[in-house]
């Protein structure tokens, strides 16, 4: 549906005018400006950038731009007492030490305040002991170690390779296995693409490069000291012992040069299979401990980082809606970086900046969106999505009543192969229709639509002729809006070819080598992929804020609900005897999904036919669409995860980055064959089916005729 019926319309004030105003050269210029020095959360440099963005957004023409500050728990290395790992001999002498910092990229030798690699929120400690190699430290890796190989990690220091799952899940798994320390490293198998040179000669990770990152298990809590409430001036803070999600054992990241020195001496058990071998010239023995000649040597960690309550600053810009100012469409992305943030986050922040500029240009010409658009530059995302979560906690009552949609805008690129979209099913049709109107930037697709290149390169596994759209997980600032508040959310970026590039993320993720030059030389010299992402993100915001009828299709939710019900039923049916014994039935869930499908279909018919010139009926229908996502929220939350309240989607309990469907049922079924009390375990499965069925039915009824 076109947005040409927006307020104050002249022919030029439409989506096309907005999109035509977006310029690749501006995105390039903004990226350069945002990446010349580090912008670590809680630092003066990042505060100054917040004020710069505030000033520029005002110049661009937003109605108001305010800083929203919070005092949250952050974590920093000790400047005078660096973190490192040693190999020690039987006399306790350090015979090898890991690097204290990454060799800086050429041209950046004299930049100050580059934070050395560290695992944010690691406790202090100097554990020493034998090493156990635990592959990716996934749930299944520990199952293999403990159950199949009978290797006990209790009292050991484990070394795990980065990749596959969120690092916080690795640390949680290691803690549960009884480890007393965790070493995280980047294996070339995951962070070095064959045939590409190391930075600065290519986009691969050098041996001295290290991935920073937080190791929290917050489960959506935000600031660890103020879960559920904003970390404002009068906040009551928990003691550190009661803080949410902090790891209990020391953790430290290293590069593959240093990992080689630790892994080359490993003895004990051989790797169980080839999936446990990376690309280093080491045996990938599991341990515990070093091989014969080195068996008296141990590994010692030296971790001295501190947790500190520190002020952070969000920038919140408002473009007031002309017709429905009390309906909010939000575009948000973070500003804080680990070091230079060449990709994460500034490739996203530069795109947001250009989107704000384009909207501001239209506004200066007399145009306003139908609904209010809020723009956000979040702080402290890297420390656990803290800025976005605190702001949402502070404004939760407004957001749950007025929030139409949230579009996330972190890194615009993680590759340059094709588009990647994760969103609520409500946005599928919006994304399809928008990408059909945009030009593909891809080589070989000149004159073709983005939809066409995207569908060709990333086809849907279920529906032929359609592109893949993934479930929302977490690990980014949409989390609080979607998983806690039930606001329809989406994200888009350009990605790599997952078929040919098996490495995790992009090789230089969260390293000092994530620079402007990385993007400008290797990923997107013409900034055409950035421009395309700006068009997708900006176009989604434009339509959501401007279309008369909200561009949500509830029928797409019906389709996925059936798919997810089928999937969880199949998982449960791996235990047919127990299902029979404990009278486990999915009938209620399938019945609710059927009802949802029928009601959604009827709602969609009414949506075509109603009188759009009647503002009351229009508002009523739009509210039913807006509140549909909200209807999937269970106020009690998921078991042991009170801030994950969406019944249809949650971050996987085994990988924060991944989305899981019907997570309550999924978790109740997970590893159920190992539960000591099967009756209780299957009782919980039944309870979760009940919660899911009720929620789907209740959501369906919000789409019924109101009276």
């Amino acid at each position: 549906k076109s947005s040409n019926e927006a307020t104050n319309i002249t022919p030029k004030h439409n989506m096309k005018a907005f999109l035509d105003e977006l310029k690749a050269e501006n995105i390039k210029k903004f990226l350069y400006n945002f990446t010349q020095i580090p912008h670590l959360a809680g630092t003066e440099q990042n505060f100054q950038l917040a004020k710069q963005i505030q000033s520029q957004w005002k110049e661009f023409g937003l109605d108001s731009v305010e800083l929203a500050h919070y005092d949250v728990l952050l974590s920093y290395p000790n400047k005078t007492h660096p973190n490192y790992i040693s190999i020690i001999n039987e006399d306790g002498n350090e015979i090898f030490n890991t690097s204290l910092f990454e060799p800086p990229p050429p041209g950046y030798e004299n930049v100050s305040d580059i934070v050395p690699p560290f695992s944010a929120f690691s406790p202090q400690g100097m554990p020493e002991g034998d090493l156990v190699y635990v592959n990716y430290a996934r749930t299944e890796d520990f199952f293999k170690l403990e159950r199949d190989m009978k290797i006990n990690c209790s009292g050991k220091i484990v070394i795990a390779r980065y990749g596959k799952v969120f690092r916080g899940n690795k640390v949680k798994n290691a803690q549960l296995a009884g480890a007393k320390g965790v070493i995280l490293y980047s294996d070339p198998a995951d962070y070095f693409a064959p045939g590409v040179k190391s930075y600065p000669d290519g986009w691969n990770l050098p041996g001295g490069g290290v991935q920073r990152g937080n190791i929290l298990n917050l489960n959506g809590a935000g600031d660890p000291l103020t879960p559920g409430y904003p970390a404002n001036e009068y906040a009551y803070r928990r003691g550190i012992a009661e803080a949410v999600g902090l790891p209990s054992i020391p953790v430290h990241p290293i590069g593959y040069y240093d990992a080689q020195k630790l892994l080359e001496k490993m003895g004990g058990s051989a790797p169980p299979d080839s999936s446990w071998r990376g690309s280093l010239k080491v045996p990938y023995n599991v341990g515990p401990g070093f091989t014969g000649n080195f068996s008296t040597q141990k590994v010692k960690m030296h971790i001295h980082s501190t947790n500190e309550v520190t002020r952070i600053y969000n920038v919140i810009g408002t473009l007031r809606g002309a017709v429905e100012p009390d309906r909010y469409v939000i575009l948000g992305g973070h500003r804080d970086s680990w070091v230079f943030g060449g990709i994460d986050p500034q490739s996203g922040a530069a795109v947001v900046h250009e989107i704000v500029r384009s909207f501001g240009t239209l506004k200066k010409e007399g145009w306003r969106p139908r609904r209010t658009i809020l723009f956000a530059s979040w702080d402290a995302e890297e420390f656990g999505l803290l800025g976005s979560t605190e702001w949402a906690e502070e404004n939760s009552r407004l957001l749950q009543e007025r929030g139409v949609a949230y579009i996330n805008a972190d890194s615009s690129i993680e590759g340059n192969y094709t588009l990647r979209v994760d969103c609520t099913p409500l946005m599928y049709s919006l994304v399809h229709n928008l990408t059909k109107e945009l030009k593909s930037p891809d080589e070989g697709f000149e004159g073709k639509s983005l939809y066409e290149s995207w569908t060709k390169k990333s086809p849907s596994p279920e529906f032929s002729g359609m592109p893949r759209i993934s479930k929302l997980g977490s690990g980014n600032d949409f989390e609080v809006f979607f998983q806690r508040l039930g606001i329809a959310s989406g994200r888009a970026r350009y990605t790599k070819n997952w078929e040919t590039n098996k490495f995790s993320g992009y090789p230089l993720y969260h390293s000092v080598y994530e620079t402007y030059e990385l993007v400008e030389k290797f990923y997107d010299p013409m900034f055409k992929y950035h421009l395309t992402v700006a068009q997708v993100r900006g176009g989604m915001v434009f339509e959501l804020a401007n279309s008369i009828v909200l561009p949500f299709d509830c029928r797409d939710y019906a389709v996925v609900l059936r798919k997810y019900a089928d999937k969880i039923y199949s998982i449960s049916m791996k235990h047919p005897q127990e299902m029979k014994t404990y009278s486990v039935s999915f009938d209620s869930l399938f019945s609710a999904v059927k009802n949802f499908t029928e009601i959604a279909s009827k709602f969609s018919e009414r949506l075509q036919d109603f009188d759009k010139s009647n503002p009351i009926v229009l508002r009523m229908m739009n509210d039913q669409l807006m509140f549909l996502e909200r209807a999937f929220i269970d106020p009690l939350g998921l078991p042991d995860r009170p801030f994950y309240r969406h019944v249809i989607y949650a971050p996987s309990s085994h990988n924060k980055y991944a989305g899981e469907s019907f997570p309550g049922i999924y978790d109740a079924l997970f590893d159920i064959e190992s539960k000591v009390d099967p009756s209780k375990a299957w009782g919980e499965v039944k309870r979760q089916i009940y919660v899911a069925a009720f929620t789907v039915q209740a959501a369906a009824e919000t789409l019924s005729e109101v009276a």
């Epitope: 090898f96 030490n97 800086p104 050429p106 000669d201 001295g208 590069g255």
Partner: nanobody, 124 residues
């Protein structure tokens, strides 16, 4: 693959001076810790001098302290060793090495890239 190429070795009289240089083939090692090892006939290879990524910090073995000076140019991707007051016991093959770590001191296998070596002979 990164290559380190030494140059400037040769024959010099005791008390004389010599400057040896090393150029790296790839920019990826331009800010690595750089070092010079030497190996005399029948002896182990050992580190005589090393320099941090920006030249702020240097290491010298006791045997060369005050006589040798290590320097670097990251733009040209070179590392130099200026050797003064040379002694016959300085006779050795000198190897340039690069290490992607903050640490200067280390053994031969703590370093990640090495040159082929250049012969320095000090005659009495």
């Amino acid at each position: 693959e990164v290559q380190l190429v030494e140059s400037g070795g040769g024959l010099v009289q005791a008390g004389g001076s010599l400057r040896i240089s090393c150029t790296a083939s790839e920019r990826s090692v331009s800010t690595y810790t750089k070092g010079w090892f030497r190996q005399a006939p029948g002896k182990e290879r050992h580190l005589v001098a090393a320099i941090s990524y920006n030249g702020d910090t240097t290491y010298y073995s006791d045997s060369v302290k005050g006589r040798f000076t290590i320097s670097r140019d990251n733009v040209k991707n070179t590392v130099n060793l200026q050797m003064n007051s040379l002694k016959p016991e300085d006779t050795a093959v000198y190897f340039c090495a690069a290490r992607g770590s903050s640490w200067l001191y280390g053994t031969w296998d703590d370093y990640h890239y090495w040159g082929q070596g250049t012969q320095v002979t000090v005659s009495s």
